[in-house]
């Protein structure tokens, strides 16, 4: 995600337009406490990170409060006073929406409508994946609001469902992250179940790009 400068790899994640996480992997400085300096405006002085992430006792990232910041993040990763990586990025291109909340299921014969709370910002896709123990892989349907109707279900089968949110690639680009999946919910004959027999563990969403 970040180009290498002096062997430094960076990753940026903007969690739900609330918190920015910048992490680095610098093999040359693996036993060094690199410092992170940032600003949100090109003409301001840099601030130093106050919330570092640690790996094996050394700094490996920074968490920044950036609630609905409409900005470019200017940052510099330093070894003492020596910058080892300096860059600026529009934060929004690294968006990771929050996981769907208040997921509800409304059944009507062979169809179910899955709803959840829409996030406060737009240009998102709400994806529902579902399967029965007889399905070899997950089926998927997505809409641009959290109101997804899936038809043609077999009322006698047990189905597992989960939901996630993705940023529209045409708007936000290819470097965003899907949200974490909601919890798996199992349903049969319009009633919730603890589990569907023989349902294999669903694959985890792939976060890295």
């Amino acid at each position: 995600q970040g180009g290498a400068a002096e062997g430094v790899q960076i990753q940026i994640i903007y969690f739900n337009l609330e918190t920015v996480q910048v992490t680095w992997n610098a093999s040359k400085y693996s036993r060094t406490n690199l410092t992170f300096h940032y600003r949100f405006n090109g003409d301001e002085a840099y601030d130093q990170c106050t919330n570092y992430l640690l790996q094996e006792g050394h700094t490996s990232g920074c968490l920044l409060d950036a609630e609905q910041r409409d900005d470019i993040l200017y940052f510099s990763i330093r070894n003492g006073t020596h910058p080892v990586f300096t860059a600026s990025r529009w934060m929004v291109y690294y968006l990771k929406p929050s996981s769907p909340k208040h997921v509800r299921f409304s059944w009507h014969q062979d169809a179910v409508t899955v709803t959840c709370s829409d996030l406060s910002y737009g240009d998102l896709l709400y994806e529902v994946q579902y399967r029965s123990p007889f399905d070899t892989e997950w089926q998927s349907k997505q809409e641009n609001t959290c109101n997804v109707t899936i038809e043609g279900l077999d009322a006698e089968k047990c189905y597992s469902f989960w939901v996630r949110v993705k940023a529209m690639e045409d708007v936000y680009g290819p470097d965003t992250y899907p949200s974490d999946w909601s919890e798996v919910t199992c349903w049969q004959r319009g009633e919730i179940r603890d589990a569907c027999a023989e349902t294999p563990t669903p694959p985890k969403p792939k976060l890295s790009k």
């Epitope: 609905q68 409409d70 291109y93 910002y121 737009g122 240009d123 680009g173």
Partner: antibody, heavy 125, light 106 residues
């Protein structure tokens, strides 16, 4: 349809000020950020910065702080660029340009689908 | 700053020709690149974004490619209305434009 209509050409003396307006129509003004772009005679394009039309928060690119001020009047869907202490090197066409994709609640992202027709500001004694 | 370098700075071609303009970024910008067309006395017009996505209403003879630092705008068969100046622009960080390529009639 989306339209950005800018004020007319200006001839100013060095040291004076100028205020360029950009009136938007055809969309909800506060939903998309507005940028300003400068083009000196026979030269390329230079992004000056942008203003969040929802919050009024301006952001200036390096080299455009101090004498340059972005402002808004949301009641008439208009963005303004004011330049003070004008210099000969400020002679240029100034464009307003609307963020094309990202909404103001999210921010901006520097892609410009809609442009004003440009305002020529000439600074000469 | 991310510097954008276009080549050539000017180009003569004929109607029907296939034309390629290149743009190089001073650092990796992934696919965060747009192309604009500007005619004398007019505002720029967005042609392509995300390096290769055609803006709505732009003729399909225009195409873009590239990723990282090297990008290309191709016009497959020049039409009379295509003679103009073309700019690349990165939007990975604060936007910067290339110096422009003036496409003239041979």
């Amino acid at each position: 349809q989306v339209q950005l209509v800018q004020s007319g050409s200006e001839l100013k003396k060095p040291g004076a000020s100028v205020k360029v307006s950009c009136k938007a129509s055809g969309y909800t003004f506060t939903s998309y950020g507005m940028s300003w772009v400068r083009q000196a005679p026979g030269q390329g394009l230079e992004w000056m910065g942008w203003v969040n039309t929802n919050t009024g928060n301006p952001r200036y690119a390096q080299g455009f702080t101090g004498r340059f001020v972005f402002s808004l009047d949301t009641s008439v869907s208009t963005a303004y660029l004011q330049i003070s202490s004008l210099k000969a090197e400020d002679t240029a066409v100034y464009y307003c340009a609307r963020e094309g994709f990202i909404r103001t609640v999210v921010g901006a992202a520097g892609r410009f689908v809609y442009w004003g027709q440009g305002t020529l500001v000439t600074v000469s004694s | 700053d991310i510097q954008m370098t276009q080549s050539p700075s000017s180009l003569s071609a004929s109607v029907g020709d296939r034309v390629t303009i290149t743009c190089r970024a001073s650092q990796d910008i992934h696919t965060r690149l747009a192309w604009y067309q500007q005619k004398p006395g007019k505002a720029p017009k967005l042609l392509i974004y995300w390096a290769s996505t055609l803006q709505s209403g732009v003729p399909s003879r225009f195409s873009g490619s590239g990723s990282g630092t090297d990008f290309t705008l191709t016009i497959s068969s020049l039409q009379p209305e295509d003679f103009a100046t073309y700019y690349c622009q990165q939007y990975s960080a604060y936007p910067t434009f290339g110096q422009g390529t003036k496409l003239e009639i041979k």
